[in-house]
């Protein structure tokens, strides 16, 4: 029979044959052969693999560094990574939660919808069409684009959610 060029789901092609992938929580020790199945081994303590895989090394669980204000929200398993969160009163700077701040700033392209208080974090919102924010800020709302018309100018460069419009002089047609 012809050697396969593609394999079923949860299989991979090697040496012209389809081998089973290792299940989540296990790593590859040796590929299958004509006579043997794929050999897999469970990940060690503090390691994980979260997909069907042919990895020869498991990934290390994330470390929630207390020096960065982090603590474990959910302990990792052989199939899942550890999830970190911030100490009470602090807030993650990103979804990955790699560091903590007292309250977040809104990135360029976003404005502050609600300023942080002693108990709640900053609430950001995307700048809608016609508005922009070019700075990271804990207080600033999105600013409206400059109205070139009111200055008797024309738009030379369109605005974005991160930049204001650029106005320029009107082209005067000579008689």
């Amino acid at each position: 029979p012809e050697p396969p060029t593609a394999c079923r789901e949860k299989q991979y092609l090697i040496n012209s044959q389809c081998c089973s992938l290792c299940q989540p929580g296990q790593k590859l020790v040796s590929d299958c052969t004509e006579f043997t199945e794929t050999e897999c081994l469970p990940c060690g303590e503090s390691e994980f693999l979260d997909t069907w895989n042919r990895e020869t090394h498991c990934h290390q669980h994330k470390y929630c560094d207390p020096n960065l204000g982090l603590r474990v929200q959910q302990k990792g398993t052989s199939e899942t990574d550890t999830i970190c969160t911030c100490e009470e009163g602090w807030h993650c700077t990103s979804e990955a939660c790699e560091s903590c701040v007292l309250h977040r700033s809104c990135s360029p392209g976003f404005g502050v919808k609600q300023i942080a208080t002693g108990v709640s974090d900053t609430i950001c919102e995307p700048c809608p069409v016609g508005f922009f924010s070019n700075v990271s800020s804990a207080f600033e709302k999105c600013h409206p684009w400059t109205s070139c018309e009111t200055k008797d100018l024309v738009v030379q460069q369109a605005g974005t959610n991160k930049t204001d419009v650029v106005c320029g002089p009107q082209d005067r047609l000579r008689a």
């Epitope: 020096n67 960065l68 204000g69 911030c86 100490e87 602090w90 700077t93 560091s99 903590c100 701040v101 007292l102 309250h103 977040r104 700033s105 700075v135 800020s137 804990a138 207080f139 600033e140």
Partner: nanobody
Framework: EVQLLASGGGLVQPGGSLRLSCAAS????????MIWVRQAPGKGLEWVSS????????YYADSVKGRFTISRDNSKNTLYLQMNSLRAEDTAVYYC?????????WGQGTLVTVSS
Amino acid sequence: EVQLLASGGGLVQPGGSLRLSCAASGFTFEEEEMIWVRQAPGKGLEWVSSISRSGGSTYYADSVKGRFTISRDNSKNTLYLQMNSLRAEDTAVYYCGKEPFRYDYWGQGTLVTVSS
């Protein structure tokens, strides 16, 4: 390297006043929103006040509103906190910082003790 050094703390009687200063270096001061926070003995960090880049907008925790005033001098790279009508519960180490205030960098604080 970012450096933020708070000074001006001390022992003051209830009802008294103090003016804290924060000398900033290692970054472009006028491009940063700034913040004062404090930590009372045995307590967590508490936000006190923040100020916009230009100094035109200021924000205060309810506990200090009407008594404290934040300001800045961008030409001197310095942040200030004028504290009036001080109370025993204002006793804390005060830290200045950039927004957003990071857990892993607090700079050098100054101790304010309000006691008779």
